[in-house]
Each structure stands twice: as structure tokens, then as C-alpha cells.
Amino acid sequence: NQDLPVIKCVLINHKNNDSSVGKSSSYPMVSESPEDLGCALRPQSSGTVYEAAAVEVDVSASITLQVLVDAPGNISCLWVFKHSSLNCQPHFDLQNRGVVSMVILKMTETQAGEYLLFIQSEATNYTILFTVSIRNTLLYTLRRPYFRKMENQDALVCISESVPEPIVEWVLCDSQGESCKEESPAVVKKEEKVLHELFGTDIRCCARNELGRECTRLFTIDLNQTPQTTLPQLFLKVGEPLWIRCKAVHVNHGFGLTWELENKALEEGNYFEMSTYSTNRTMIRILFAFVSSVARNDTGYYTCSSSKHPSQSALVTIVEKGFINATNSSEDYEIDQYEEFCFSVRFKAYPQIRCTWTFSRKSFPCEQKGLDNGYSISKFCNHKHQPGEYIFHAENDDAQFTKMFTLNIRRKPQVLAEASASQASCFSDGYPLPSWTWKKCSDKSPNCTEEITEGVWNRKANRKVFGQWVSSSTLNMSEAIKGFLVKCCAYNSLGTSCETILLNSPGPFPFIQDNIS
């Protein structure tokens, strides 16, 4: 049809922190590059109806639905969403195309549905249909990658059964220890599923999608190294594949490698060998031990032996269910105001945990580091010397673990005072929790040395703010002290702090704060 305009429908994803609701706009926000939604003519429909490709949006994401119309003359438009008309303000771009936009900020369930755009131009009328739905991330999964041998080839395939389809990459490193950290120059990444170069020192496969990134290291025994401080231990769940690589370098080819499980040679079909010459003409051999789906009886000591190297073993433990082993007893710490200190949790877990540190309802990222002895450790140092309760939470597919920490900061009390018609109260958050004294200031005692013991009520821990204890002391007003100045003092091993209050009328009248060290 010659009269039909050339139209283009696009989706623009925004990186904004706005919290307003959906609105029609002619000036969308700064955004990422637009995604073409196609906008094809819908067949067998009464009138001219264009249909854009379905749009899936994450909860709380912000998007713009945009239509570009290449038609002569002015256009007028109307958006309709759930039987409600929404204002529509077309404008023209530099190429003189009509531009109509619908901005949806902070996508919610209520903003999902069909958005109809009616456009009237000088030549014709037509409708554009957008279907917007919330992406169902409940169906999303990110599974740890595992290895398979490629059929008829000496190569490994990395598989991650995840939704949406993940990007798989091999992370390779040929040096030892610290220099194999993710962003080190020694690390090479290959975005492919199949790996042929299997002789490297450190081989990992990672899979990433919208849910994050998961990696699996190819478990390796290197016969040229001295043994690890702890016997290497590998945990697997029943049904998972087992892969262990044994690697050895020798001056010539005259050596062989073998795998044994509990002193019995592995059956044929459960291992394969590869060899190559390195740059200095030494021979590198690797021997893989593998079981495509482990059972309980695959548990035991796997020993790699060589005719020219000392043997080394790894303990493979097959479990029915994942686990997190750590002591969950709560721990209390007392530190000085400028003391360097980190909370730490040592744990053994399989599969690898996801974890968070929480303080005052705020979550902090959690890093974990593998130790030589098969344990992992997570440290939290970013407490900024704020006293209170800190929570470490870890979970994996099968287990959950929570540990509480209390941080107390040793400091001199700071006193706040308030008075009412019947009593005066003082509060302090110093640590260790302070003791209190009340003193009366009078002609007889201008230095406020006359101690008040009657009518004093101390509460050791009156308010617990995210684990931070506050101590208070209240003085009930009697005729004997009405109209006088009284002084409350809080003291602990780090010092004393006082506040003076006038007891003659309601309302707080503290007017002097003494800080006595």
C-alpha cells in the first residue's frame, strides 16, 4: 500500500533512579542504544494495525516505547492503556520524522499490558500495538558450569544449564597463586564452550547471565609441586560429574601417569591422557580421571602416580546434599575507636555459597576466599567503627547459615539530658556501659559535690538500636531538689561526662555539658 507511512518502533532501556510512574513524554531520558522492535503490519485486522515485538522488562526497570513516523505533514496521537487515554505529545526529530514516546519508569506489575498508540496523519489513520510484560525472573537459573569430554576429541566442553542461556567463557592462567587473580595480566579469557588447550596451570570455566556469574575450577594435582598444606579435598553431590586432572612435567617423554582409587586402577573409559612438548622441550603429560555421574561408592582417595614423580592424592567425598559447616555461635567484639578490625567467618561448604553481611538493615557485598586447608573465609572490615549487631548470612542450593556478631566500640560516655515536670533523665551510649552519679548544686555545694542517692533509677540497657546498647539514669523530682541545679555524670574506664539540668519547670534545660576525662 503506497499510502502507508514508514514507521519504526524502538525500545529504549534506561539506567535511571527515578521513582515516578509511567508517563507519556516527548523527551525521553538519557538512555542506552535503542532496540528495534520490528513493527510489522498485523494481517487480517480491521484497519491498519502495526504490532511491535513483545517487550519483556525487569521489575523496577525504566523503559521508553518509541515510534518514529516517516510521513508528510503533521500527526496527532493518543495512547490507550487498560481503557484509559493517556496524553500524547508528538515532536519532530532532525530528520523531520514524527517521534512519539511512552516512558515507563520503575516497571511494576500494574504497568504491564497492552499499550495502543493511535496515530492520525494527513494521509491515513493507523494503530500501533505494544505488549509489555514483566520478565519472570523466578524462572531464571544460573547453574555452576560442569565439564564434559568432547566426543572423539581431546577437548573439554563447558556446560551451564541456565536460563536465560548464559555466556560461557574459559579463564586460563599459566602462573602460580596470586598472579592468577581475575584481573591479572596473566589471565586469558576465551568466550567459547570448547577448550582444546588443557595444559595450563589454572583452568576455570565461568557462565554468566542476568543472575550473575558462576565459575568452576578444573581440579588439578601437579606432581611437580610439593603437596598442598592440606590434602586436597573435592566435594560432589550424587549425580554430578567428577573431573580431576593430574599434570606432570619431565625432561623427556619417558614417563607415564596412572590414576588409582583406593589402590585400585581406574577402569578404562574413566581416564584419558594428553601430552605435549613445552617451549623448553620438556614433556608435559596430563591424565584426566572422570566419572560422568558420581555415586556414593566413588568416594575415596584418588592417587595419581608417575614413573618419575612422587605420587599425590586427593580425597573425593560424594554427598547426598550440599552443606555449610561453620560455628554459628554469636561472637562479641570490643575494640578501640581507631583499632583496625575485621569480622571473619571460616566455613567449609559445597556447593559454593552466596553470602551477605548486614548491619542496620543494610546489606553489604560479601567476598569469600579459599584457604589452603579446604576451608573458605569471608571477612567484613567496612563497619566504620559503628557499634551494633552485624549478621553474616550464607546459603547454597541445599543449606542456609546465619551468624551474629556484636561490635562494641570502647569510648568515653557522651551524655544527653532531658527533664519533665516530675523527673530528669540522662542517657549515654559509651562503652563499657557507664555507671551513673547524680549531684546537687547548692550554696553549700557550689561545685556540685553533694551526691543524690534517693529517687535515682538506673537502667543498664534501655534501648537496643541495632545491637547498640544505651544506658540511662532517671532522677525522680522531690521537694528537696526542685529549683536546684543537678548534675548527672556517666563514667566508665575511659572517662567521665556530665550534664547539668535546672529542675524548676517542664522542658529540658541542660545548659552546661562537662567533659571530664
Partner: antibody, heavy 118, light 107 residues
């Protein structure tokens, strides 16, 4: 049969170094780690370190780090342990021991007495 | 490092007696434990490895048991040549560590 034969007794002054040898025979030298263990007079056994005769890589107890060096000569099937900056508390019998698997010491040398005295 | 504690530190017994020596690890070491016998002026000799496996050539009157943190060496019927010092050693981690020894003397 498997044998580990160590060098003879040594008397050294404080601050000096000593190098003890351990010659292996009766098995493929590069197929077993060799450990060094010492025993002070009337005391128990204390681990000093381990060497991989195939590659020459070694690992030492924290206590001896920086003072001990373990080397090997594959042509003579011999491992060496050198201890420097000697002090009187280093007086001990030093044993080399073959590692059967996972730090299991199935054969031991006869021991070398190192005496540190001024 | 893992601490190994042996008890008793010395023991008097007679030929034909059944003797038990215990060894405790400061943390779980699975079954990675060996027992050695040492006679004065001699190098130690491996008796038991992996907590309960008898080293070849060692008489069957020697036996070992235990796993985790608690281990036992048993001599079922003491012979004159068994009077010596016995050491346990963990091979779960490097550094391997030894117990302080148990001196077995003739009563």
C-alpha cells in the same frame, strides 16, 4: 632394598652453616618426596621441610623459613639440607625420611648429629 | 598447625600385657594418622598408617584405631623388643606434626 644413608656428624659454631646429605638407593629416586625431621637430645620429633626430588621444589616449616634450603642431585640420587645462622638450640639429630604417600615416612636415614657449640 | 597430644607420656608394663596408647588431634584429621616406634640411638620405624593399616613387616600384635580427633595404638601382648618410645603423627596437613611421645618401660 630401600636405603637412605646420611652424612656423618658435624660440630659447628653459632652463626655458621651446616649441609647434611641423604643418599637414596633401592628405589626410583624421583618417585618419592623426601622429608627432613629433627630430634633435639631427649626431645620429640620436629618436621623441618619437604623436597620434591623430581622438580626440586621444596617447602619448609615456618620456624625454619629463611634459614633452611633443601636441594637435590638426581644424578647421584642425593638430597641435601642446609641450615644457616646456627644457634645452640639447633643441636639435634637430623633425619631424612622417604614419603610413601601423604606424609607417611616408611624409610628413614640413620640420622646425622649436628652439634652447635661455641 | 595441628597439635597432637599423646597420653600417657610414660607407661610401665610387663611382657605379655595388653597396652594402649592414645593420641588426640587439636582438630579433625580424618584417618590421616601414623604411629612410629623409636628405640634409643635409632631412627623411628613406621608401624601403622592411615590410622589402622599395618605397615608390611610389622607384627600383627600392633593395631591402630580411631578417626577424627581420637586415636589408639594397641599392643595386644607385649614382647621384650617392644619396649621403646612411640610417637603418633598426623599427615592430614603440612606441616606434619608429631605427638610428644610415650615411653614404654619394663615394669
Amino acid at each position: 632394598q630401600v636405603q637412605l644413608v646420611q652424612s656423618g656428624a658435624e660440630v659447628k659454631k653459632p652463626g655458621a652453616s651446616v649441609k647434611v646429605s641423604c643418599k637414596a638407593s633401592g628405589y626410583t629416586f624421583t618417585r618419592h618426596y623426601v622429608h627432613w625431621v629433627r630430634q633435639a637430645p631427649g626431645q620429640g620429633l620436629e618436621w623441618v621441610g619437604i623436597i620434591n626430588p623430581s622438580s626440586g621444589s621444596a617447602s619448609y616449616a615456618q620456624k625454619f623459613q629463611g634459614r633452611v634450603t633443601m636441594t637435590r642431585d638426581t644424578s647421584t640420587s642425593t638430597v641435601y639440607m642446609e641450615l644457616s645462622s646456627l644457634r645452640s638450640e639447633d643441636t639435634a639429630v637430623y633425619y631424612c625420611a622417604r614419603d610413601r604417600l601423604r606424609s607417611r615416612f616408611d624409610y628413614w636415614g640413620q640420622g646425622t648429629l649436628v652439634t652447635v657449640s661455641s | 598447625d595441628i597439635q597432637m597430644t599423646q597420653s600417657p607420656s610414660s607407661l610401665s608394663a610387663s611382657v605379655g600385657d595388653r597396652v594402649t596408647i592414645t593420641c588426640r588431634a587439636s582438630q579433625s584429621i580424618s584417618s590421616s594418622l601414623a604411629w612410629y616406634q623409636q628405640k634409643p640411638g635409632k631412627a623411628p620405624k613406621l608401624l601403622i598408617y592411615a590410622a589402622s593399616s599395618l605397615q608390611s613387616g610389622v607384627p600383627s600384635r600392633f593395631s591402630g584405631s580411631g578417626s577424627g580427633t581420637d586415636f589408639t595404638l594397641t599392643i595386644s601382648s607385649l614382647q621384650p623388643e617392644d619396649f621403646a618410645t612411640y610417637y603418633c603423627q598426623q599427615s592430614y596437613t603440612i606441616p606434619p606434626t608429631f605427638g610428644q611421645g610415650t615411653k614404654l618401660e619394663i615394669k
